[in-house]
């Protein structure tokens, strides 16, 4: 056979479908790889051919379009399963060709099983709702094209094992599920089951998504630097380790990039010669507000280092803030003679740098270590 432009296995499209449910799968060539659509290709005399490789096999084989009740069929650039079976799992290839042109792409299709509470290995899309924000809706996803607009399906919504009925603040409204006022208790997995008739048969489409209740933009504030602050002075003797935490609270903001960084004498730590290490950790509240802590560490601080300006900066979509740490060199306590009287030991405690306890909130923690010379 003549040469064919082979786009390989498109693993970006990890298609997962439920067992015993209809599935319509569009050939990815027209969506991601070619600059023309199926209609144009068809008008130009190109033919779309489908074949597949079963799971754990190497042999490419044609798809059987002569199964009872047309279980697998092709319509334009769509491969239809009515319904899927577990052993339909495999790599599917669509090839567009005529005598002079050929282009093909393969993609994995996984048929997955679900239990009675809709648990499955299916990767779930996440829908974020703002906490206490007024009415917000989620819509049963990926059901377009399965039945004509003349067909009126029945839609049942579930949270886990339970049908959504009589809930305090969640109301099923056909394809939509309305949250009158979203609360933390509304976090979880929601499933819509769409039931529709076709040629005397009844089909079900199951779609599950994760709802995550997040901080409301009404309550969002610019970054808040909790540390360094005016109450803590970092007093060190040369040769000691200097540790300064920068702890910043960020309100949740959709698609906002939160940044924290230190400057030393106005320069990024990368751009100066002193041996400084920055350790970062991130924690999230239940509503995805974020606390970032960057600990600046100088193992053996010098007199020069103790004269520098250490400033913590933070930025989000809500604004930028900065705060300087109070750093000074510890003044050695005067030596008293015996006659000079005791009772001064406490002075050392007053001048001692306050110790800061660093508490990471609950949630997910990510640690990053940067070493700068």
């Amino acid at each position: 056979s003549e040469r064919c432009d082979d786009w390989g296995l498109d693993t970006m499209r990890q298609i997962q479908v439920f067992e015993d449910e209809p599935a319509r799968i569009k050939c990815p060539l027209f969506e991601h790889f070619l600059k023309f659509n199926y209609s144009t290709a068809h008008s130009a005399g190109l033919t779309l051919i489908w074949y597949w490789t079963r799971q754990d096999r190497d042999l490419e084989e044609p798809i059987n379009f002569r199964l009872p009740e047309n279980r697998i069929s092709k319509e334009k650039d769509v491969l239809w399963f009515r319904p899927t079976l577990l052993n339909d799992t495999g790599n599917y290839t669509c090839m567009l060709r005529n005598t002079t042109y050929c282009s093909k792409v393969a993609f994995p299709l996984e048929v997955v099983q679900k239990d009675s509470c809709f648990n499955s290995p299916m990767k779930l899309p996440v829908h974020k709702l703002y906490i206490e924000y007024g009415i917000q809706r989620i819509t049963c996803p990926n059901v377009d094209g399965y039945f004509p607009s003349s067909v009126k399906p029945t839609i049942t919504w579930y949270m886990g094992c339970y049908k959504i009925q009589n809930f305090n603040n969640v109301i099923p409204e056909g394809m939509n599920l309305s949250f009158l006022i979203a609360l933390i208790s509304n976090n979880g997995n929601y499933t819509c089951v769409v039931t529709y008739p076709e040629n005397g048969r009844t089909f079900h489409l199951t779609r599950t998504l994760t709802v995550k209740v997040v901080g409301s933009p009404k309550n969002a504030v610019p970054p808040v630097i909790h540390s360094p602050n005016d109450h803590v002075v970092y007093e060190k003797e040369p040769g000691e380790e200097l540790l300064i935490p920068c702890t910043v609270y960020f309100s949740f903001l959709m698609d906002s990039r939160n940044e924290v960084w230190w400057t030393i004498d106005g320069k990024k730590p990368d751009d100066i010669t002193i041996d400084v290490t920055i350790n970062e950790s991130i924690s999230h509240s239940r509503t995805e507000d974020e606390t970032r802590t960057q600990i600046l560490s100088i193992k053996k601080v010098t007199s020069e280092d103790l004269k520098r300006s250490y400033v913590c900066h933070a930025r989000s979509a809500k604004g930028e803030v900065a705060k300087a740490a109070k750093v000074k060199q510890k003044v050695p306590a005067p030596r008293y003679t015996v006659e000079g009287g005791g009772g001064t030991g406490g002075l050392n405690d007053i001048f001692e740098a306050q110790k800061i306890e660093w508490h990471e909130g609950g949630g997910h923690h990510h640690h990053h270590h940067h070493h700068h010379h």
Partner: antibody
């Protein structure tokens, strides 16, 4: 360790109502459902209904519709099952049961209360 | 609603012997079936869910099998503490329904 503690035995007259309580201790942060199941003397188990305390959702078995009301007080982690228009055949041990989450298929009756005997007699 | 039928109603077995209990559903419940054990004066205890998965703390002598409409609970070697009533329950369709129970008694 999650535990369910039910209210004590009750003797009721036909036509009256009974309200059985079920207090959960060591409750997880995630929503869960409380199920109610009854067992007449020497008989099998019969599911009556459920409530999801933190979300308010509930449902009842067809047989008990109109006679049973299941409620919950989240502040005290207590669920209640009220059965009205009692008759002698309602004499049974009433159990509450629950799972850890709303998602555990097959484990929605993971933890059981000790049961409450309700005797209906004139 | 789905009707669950258990057999036999009573099973007489000697300690150390194998006991096999059956449960039939009036329509397919896939693998959405649980087994419970109940001793006199006690609440039921979950033994098996998903037709074959043992619940936490349940000894290995208890095993479940089957799918669709036919299910079996097997106790490989009966101990004195296993003499009790056993119930199956389907949770494939609402309302969730129980079988009428099988009493396992000492022979």
């Amino acid at each position: 360790q999650v535990q369910l503690v039910q209210s004590g035995a009750e003797v009721k007259k036909p036509g009256s109502s009974v309200k059985v309580s079920c207090k959960a201790s060591g409750s997880p942060a995630e929503p869960y459902a409380i199920q109610w199941v009854r067992q007449a003397p020497g008989q099998g188990l019969e599911w009556m209904g459920y409530i999801i305390p933190s979300l308010g959702g509930y449902d009842y078995a067809q047989k008990f519709q109109g006679r049973v009301t299941i409620t919950a007080d989240e502040s005290t982690s207590t669920a209640y099952m009220e059965l009205s228009s009692l008759r002698s055949e309602d004499t049974a041990v009433y159990y509450c049961a629950r799972g850890q989450t709303l998602y555990d298929s097959g484990r929605q009756f993971d933890i059981w209360g000790q049961g409450t005997l309700v005797t209906v007699s004139s | 609603e789905i009707v669950m039928t258990q057999s036999p109603a009573t099973l007489s077995v000697s300690p150390g012997e194998r006991a096999t209990l059956s449960c039939r559903a009036s329509q397919s419940v896939s693998s959405n079936l649980a087994w419970y054990q109940q001793k006199p004066g006690q609440a039921p205890r979950l033994l098996i869910y998903g037709a074959s998965t043992r619940a936490t703390g349940i000894p290995a002598r208890f095993s479940g099998s089957g799918s669709g409409t036919e299910f079996t609970l097997t106790i490989s070697s009966l101990q004195s503490e296993d003499f009790a009533v056993y119930y199956c329950q389907q949770y494939n369709n609402w309302p969730w329904t129980f079988g009428q129970g099988t009493k396992v008694e000492i022979k």
